[in-house]
Interface confidence: low
């Protein structure tokens, strides 16, 4: 499955768990494999394109979410989701344009 599809689906499900169920553990279980995939690096041109378009913002969001694990400051997760939501919107717009 293409990275942008995995991230789009993953962010959608993770946001449902976070905002809908307040299930932070479940949210991390979905997002961390996606970040691990991103961290391993792109292996195709499409993955390279995704990494260049969204990698920096997703890494910044991940740093906020990891900070939450040590700080327990809910505002850190809110900040992470500000960025995740922004990326989700950009991926959604890109999908809509190309389909």
């Amino acid at each position: 499955i293409l990275w942008h599809e995995q991230w789009h689906e993953g962010l959608e499900e993770a946001s449902r768990l976070y905002f809908g169920d307040r299930n932070v553990k479940g949210m991390f279980e979905i997002l961390e494999p996606l970040h691990a995939m991103l961290e391993r690096g792109p292996q195709t041109l499409k993955e390279t394109s995704f990494s260049q378009a969204y990698g920096r913002e997703l890494t910044e969001a991940y740093e906020w979410s990891q900070r939450y694990k040590t700080s327990a400051v809910v505002m850190d997760l809110d900040r992470a989701w500000d960025i995740y939501y922004h990326v989700f919107q950009k991926i959604s717009r890109h999908h809509h344009h190309h389909h």
Epitope: S71, A72, V73, V74, M75, D78, D82, I83
Partner: antibody, heavy 124, light 107 residues
């Protein structure tokens, strides 16, 4: 122009209730943290609570937890502070303040806009 | 809770003086510290955010710095309109806290 206007203060007896309103204009409350901060006469600033309407998250100072409830109505662009079981030590000017919560983050937890304050007096 | 210990509680100074106010956090707060100025009967005004960033419209004589858990607000040359009370605030913890305040009075 960004503006915050508090209302609802007044004189109330110990054990009574009061609801404060914070009407926002010039920005969308759903993309900001809205805080309540109070200042007892001649004293310093004390943070009371915040709400992040985008996610519904709230946080309270220990001194008001269980007695005060913060909420927001995004359709009215207004935040509220419901104060129950009021005590003499809750007497203060209550300010609402904004911390921008959108993307990108701006002022890193600082309150860039404040209302003029509303006085709450708890006395028999 | 994270405590912000502010000193001094008050100081007397003259126009043109360099004034320094300090806040010490009881634990690490990263750089999530802001400084405010408050005049009697008025709401506080933001001066400094993120420990050292000057808020828009604030005169450049105000500056902030950080050294570990110590945070400093400096007024390089005190002006008549600067006589007021100053507060630090941390927003790193889930419970936000202010310093006790420093009243800057005319000598």
């Amino acid at each position: 122009e960004v503006q915050l206007v508090e209302s609802g203060g007044g004189l109330v007896q110990p054990g009574g209730s009061l609801r404060l309103s914070c009407a926002a204009s010039g920005f969308n409350v759903s993309s900001s943290y809205i805080h309540w901060v109070r200042q007892a006469p001649g004293k310093g600033l004390e943070w009371v609570a915040y709400i992040y309407p985008y996610s519904g998250y709230t946080s309270y100072a220990d001194s008001v937890k269980g007695r005060f409830t913060i909420s927001a109505d995004t359709s009215k662009n207004t935040a509220y502070l419901q104060m129950n079981s009021l005590r003499a030590e809750d007497t203060a000017v209550y300010y609402c303040a904004r911390n921008y919560g959108g993307y990108p983050r701006k002022y890193a937890g600082a309150f860039d806009y404040w209302g003029q304050g509303t006085l709450v007096t708890v006395s028999s | 809770d994270i405590q912000m210990t502010q000193s001094p509680s008050s100081l007397s100074a003259s126009v043109g003086d360099r004034v320094t106010i300090t806040c010490r956090a009881s634990q690490s707060v990263s750089s999530a510290v802001a400084w405010y100025q408050q005049k009697p009967g008025k709401a506080p005004k933001l001066l400094i955010y993120s420990a050292s960033s000057l808020y828009s419209g604030v005169p450049s004589r105000f500056s902030g710095s950080r050294s570990g858990t110590d945070f400093t607000l400096t007024i390089s040359s005190l002006q008549p309109e600067d006589f007021a009370t100053y507060y630090c605030q941390q927003s790193y913890g889930s419970l936000i806290t202010f310093g006790q305040g420093t009243k800057v009075e005319i000598k």
